[in-house]
Amino acid sequence: EEELQVIQPEKSVSVAAGDSATLNCTVSSLIPVGPIQWFRGAGPGRELIYNLKEGHFPRVTPVSDPTKRNNMDFSIRISNITPADAGTYYCVKFRKGSPDVELKSGAGTELSVRAKPSAPVVSGPAVRATAEHTVSFTCESHGFSPRDITLKWFKNGNELSDFQTNVDPAGKSVSYSIRSTARVVLTRRDVHSQVICEVAHVTLQGDPLRGTANLSEAIRVPPFLEVTQQSMRADNQVNVTCQVTKFYPQRLQLTWLENGNVSRTEMASALPENKDGTYNWTSWLLVNVSAHRDDVKLTCQVEHDGQPAVNKSFSVKVSAHPKEQGSNTAAENTGTNERNIYGGSG
């Protein structure tokens, strides 16, 4: 009588998460009488996966009709595979007894689960940085298997090379995670720029997953300030303009100082956007020259995005303007002529 053989023809089987896995097993003889059981893993800690003899295994079904004695086929199908099902499965023949006696095991079939990576999540720096500075972006994706994965970074469609990528864990696991950090040098033109993290994996059939981050969340473009005086008006009032240009984000506070004293404070809001994503703002102040004996030092003070204030000063030469008899002594006309002009230039 030939020795009983337990045949597991496939050394390995790869299945996509959510699909069913078929694990094949045949025996060369039905003698002696006794059950076939399926285990994951070997040794004392092995996990019972299916026992024809007893138990409730809702995800496992025999491939062949177990009531047909002569088929010798003890293959099983496991439904709704998840990465947690990965491992080596053994088909084991027992001889009936109390307890059942293990006679022979198959060579084992390694089940690997192809699981898609999660959508990459890209996160940028916690604080904004200005042009010429380097900021780091991190991309994370989880739950994929097998371990082999490709990650690329792009900025406005151009591939980046300054990045470091890690796949964890380093050893064998049911699923893996990837984390990559890219270093990006900012320019003043990056308000509308985007970084893209692209993940390619065997489960994605050539259609990579992408995660994006807008550099607008990471960049601060400080404003240019220019204070100019318009020509004298007939009513002895001088129009002084403070042009604040090319700044981002919009969060900006402007304060006019006359000879060091706060004259007016304004907050930027609802500004039109320049083509490059930055903003411009113009504020102007009317100064009644005839009310001053000495030159007036006007300062436009801009506080942008919580940064230290930037000042630009301008002196209005009172001596250059003849005084009007009986003029108002106020340093500033506080009537309706005193106003801001909000303007945007490209």
Partner: antibody, heavy 118, light 107 residues
Framework: EVQLVESGGGLVQPGGSLRLSCAAS????????MHWVRQATGKGLEWVSA???????YYTGSVKGRFTISRENAKNSLYLQMNSLRAGDTAVYYC????????????WGQGTMVTVSS | DIQMTQSPSSLSASVGDRVTITCRAS??????LAWFQQKPGKAPKSLIY???SLHSGVPSKFSGSGSGTDFTLTISSLQPEDFATYYC?????????FGQGTKLEIK
């Protein structure tokens, strides 16, 4: 339909012989362990004999050396040759199929009556 | 030989009752225990194998449990067709042996 039909029972004198047959249909008899079980009138069930798929045979102590179980694959039939019959062998004899992998009884024949009496 | 002891030997119950029959083996038989139902003048019918698995076509009102030496058969809600004699059997090793039977009668 899976079915077992026994025949060959009857009245026999003590010391006599009888050959019971069991015709199987709906399955291949040689692929299963097959059994004979008997039941004396008003009594419980008693396992008598078995034949495995490899032709290995088993008997209860009281019939060893007197009864022989066999099968004929070509006829898909099981037999029980009963010699040196005794009054205590009087019973209904059932042919039973053993289950797929553990030999749990699943299919029973309707039985045939054997009476040993002078 | 392994001895199988059933209790009670007989049992009176009413339609709708839940009844339990026990079977004890003289030694550990793992879960290689079967239950059979037999009506007068008929061949036994297989109900349960490996202590708790129902044969095909057997209604779920029948259930079995146990392992080792102590086993039970439970009928959840008796119907008129359930009044019969019930036998347990060990089939872990030859000679296979049966319990003496439990006769379930209508009250």
């Amino acid at each position: 339909e899976v079915q077992l039909v026994e025949s060959g029972g009857g009245l026999v004198q003590p010391g006599g012989s009888l050959r019971l047959s069991c015709a199987a249909s709906g399955f291949t008899l040689s692929s299963y362990d097959m059994h004979w079980v008997r039941q004396a009138t008003g009594k419980g069930l008693e396992w008598v004999s078995a034949i495995g798929t490899a032709g290995d045979t088993y008997y209860t102590g009281s019939v060893k050396g007197r009864f022989t179980i066999s099968r004929e694959n070509a006829k898909n039939s099981l037999y029980l040759q009963m010699n040196s019959l005794r009054a205590g062998d009087t019973a209904v004899y059932y042919c039973v199929r053993g289950g797929v992998w553990d030999d749990a009884f699943d299919i029973w024949g309707q039985g045939t009556m054997v009476t040993v009496s002078s | 030989d392994i001895q199988m002891t059933q209790s009670p030997s007989s049992l009176s119950a009413s339609v709708g009752d839940r009844v339990t029959i026990t079977c004890r083996a003289s030694q550990d038989i793992n879960n290689y225990l079967a239950w059979f139902q037999q009506k007068p003048g008929k061949a036994p019918k297989s109900l349960i194998y490996t202590a708790s698995s129902l044969h095909s076509g057997v209604p779920s009102k029948f259930s079995g449990s146990g392992s080792g030496t102590d086993f039970t058969l439970t009928i959840s809600s008796l119907q008129p067709e359930d009044f019969a004699t019930y036998y347990c059997q060990q089939y872990v090793s030859y000679p296979y042996t049966f319990g003496q039977g439990t006769k379930l009668e209508i009250k």
